[in-house]
Interface confidence: low
């Protein structure tokens, strides 16, 4: 907290410029008008203020906007954003994707901080749903973003947004999350032809039910073992040997290397030995 002191004669700042870097903290507090600072926030980023000086500038903005900063100020916070607490950010109403991008850029290359998580939460709640442009932006900055959401939060993702999702965005998703995302992906890609559809749907298949896997087995998709191993065990168990053989195509030989791991292990135990023998892989049920 900076004490209130009168501004020395001739030191009142007519604008936000480089001369302020040589003001002591109390001089910044006394001589910089908060309303001027708010209108010239875009200049702050170009001036080499110290951490301590930024604390003073933040304090001035906090006093001017006790209920939370307006978006016109938020958009130009730049590195001052790193000084904000989640409690500060919860007071904001951020609606512009450009504002979101500007602040994410400040934190670029770092883990998602509590400040960023709060900002994103406020933004998405304000929009009501995770639309394609927002998802595109968030996954560009944080590839694991989608998988950090709860199944309940994922339910607000419209199918049209699924087009923005890349395979790597789903790497850390668990089955409960894929259960929510898969039907949306199925809907989003429904008008694509067989091979193109499979390329798009592949990374979501950890949420696919048995009947969809059976349907895929009829389409010569040649699913790789890595994808097969991520399928829901309960969805794989009812598949016949013939269906799994069709589903995997030339990759069926990989079952031998995975015979001790789920879902392959559990699926093998459900099959008749005669049927398994037709694969010629030496699988023992």
């Amino acid at each position: 907290e900076v004490e209130k002191t009168a501004c020395p004669s001739g030191k009142k700042a007519p604008e936000i410029d480089e001369s302020l870097i040589f003001y002591k903290k109390w001089e910044l507090e006394a001589c910089v008008d908060a309303a001027l600072l708010a209108t010239q926030m875009d200049r702050v980023n170009a001036i080499p203020f110290t951490y301590e000086q930024l604390d003073v500038l933040k304090h001035k903005l906090d006093e001017l906007y006790p209920q939370g900063y307006p978006e016109s100020v938020i958009q130009h916070l730049g590195y001052l954003f790193l000084k904000m607490s989640p409690e500060d950010i919860r007071k904001w109403n951020v609606t512009s994707l450009e504002t979101l991008k500007a602040l994410l850029e400040v934190n670029k290359g770092h883990e998602m901080s509590p400040q960023v998580a709060t900002l994103i939460d406020r933004f998405v709640k304000g929009r009501g749903q995770l639309d394609k442009d927002t998802l595109d932006t968030l996954t560009a900055f944080y590839p694991g973003y989608l998988c950090s959401l709860s199944p309940e939060e994922l339910s607000s993702v419209p199918p049209s947004s699924i087009w923005a999702v890349r395979p790597q965005d789903l790497d850390t998703c668990d089955p409960r999350q894929l259960d929510v995302l898969y039907p949306k992906a199925r809907l989003a890609f429904q008008n694509m032809n067989g091979s193109e559809y499979f390329v798009k749907i592949q990374s979501f298949l950890g949420g696919a039910p048995t009947e969809d896997l059976k349907a895929l087995s009829q389409q010569n998709v040649s699913m790789d073992l890595a994808t097969f191993m991520k399928l829901r065990t309960d969805a794989v168990l009812p598949l016949t040997v013939a269906e799994v053989q069709k589903l995997l195509g030339p990759h069926v030989e990989g079952l031998k290397a995975e015979e001790r791991h789920r879902p392959v292990r559990d699926w093998i135990l459900r099959q008749r030995q005669d049927d398994l023998d037709t694969l010629g892989l030496g699988l023992q049920g």
Partner: nanobody
Framework: EVQLVESGGGLVQAGGSLRLSCAAS????????MGWYRQAPGKQRELVAA???????NYADSVKGRFTISRDNAKNTVYLQMNSLKPEDTAVYYC???????????WGQGTQVTVSS
């Protein structure tokens, strides 16, 4: 990201002069304000002189009239001419674009300036 390499430090008698250089890599160098900072043992890093992208300059009270900061945007270099050096100017000198306000700011190795009495 701008990479910074400082040079020109050394051992000098009180009253002597040194010229420090800071070479920056990065195409956006010319749009940044630049600062020379120094850190003496056991003390906080302090801003000594700053120059805006347009060339306007500012100095800490302790070096006013003795130090001159300048920049050559064509060479991506910023300079600090240090005259009438005093023992209390002894420190490691660094240049940087935005001061120590960003946790991940990439500071160079700095250049040691030692002023003997």
């Amino acid at each position: 990201e701008v990479q910074l390499v400082e040079s020109g430090g050394g051992l000098v008698q009180a009253g002597g002069s040194l010229r420090l250089s800071c070479a920056a890599s990065g195409s956006t160098f010319s749009s940044y304000p630049m600062g020379w900072y120094r850190q003496a043992p056991g003390k906080q890093r302090e801003l000594v002189a700053a120059i805006s992208s347009g060339g306007s300059t500012n100095y800490a009270d302790s070096v006013k009239g003795r130090f001159t900061i300048s920049r050559d945007n064509a060479k991506n270099t910023v300079y600090l001419q240090m005259n009438s050096l005093k023992p209390e100017d002894t420190a490691v000198y660094y240049c940087n674009t935005r001061s120590p306000r960003v946790p991940n700011d990439s500071w160079g190795q700095g250049t040691q300036v030692t002023v003997s009495s």
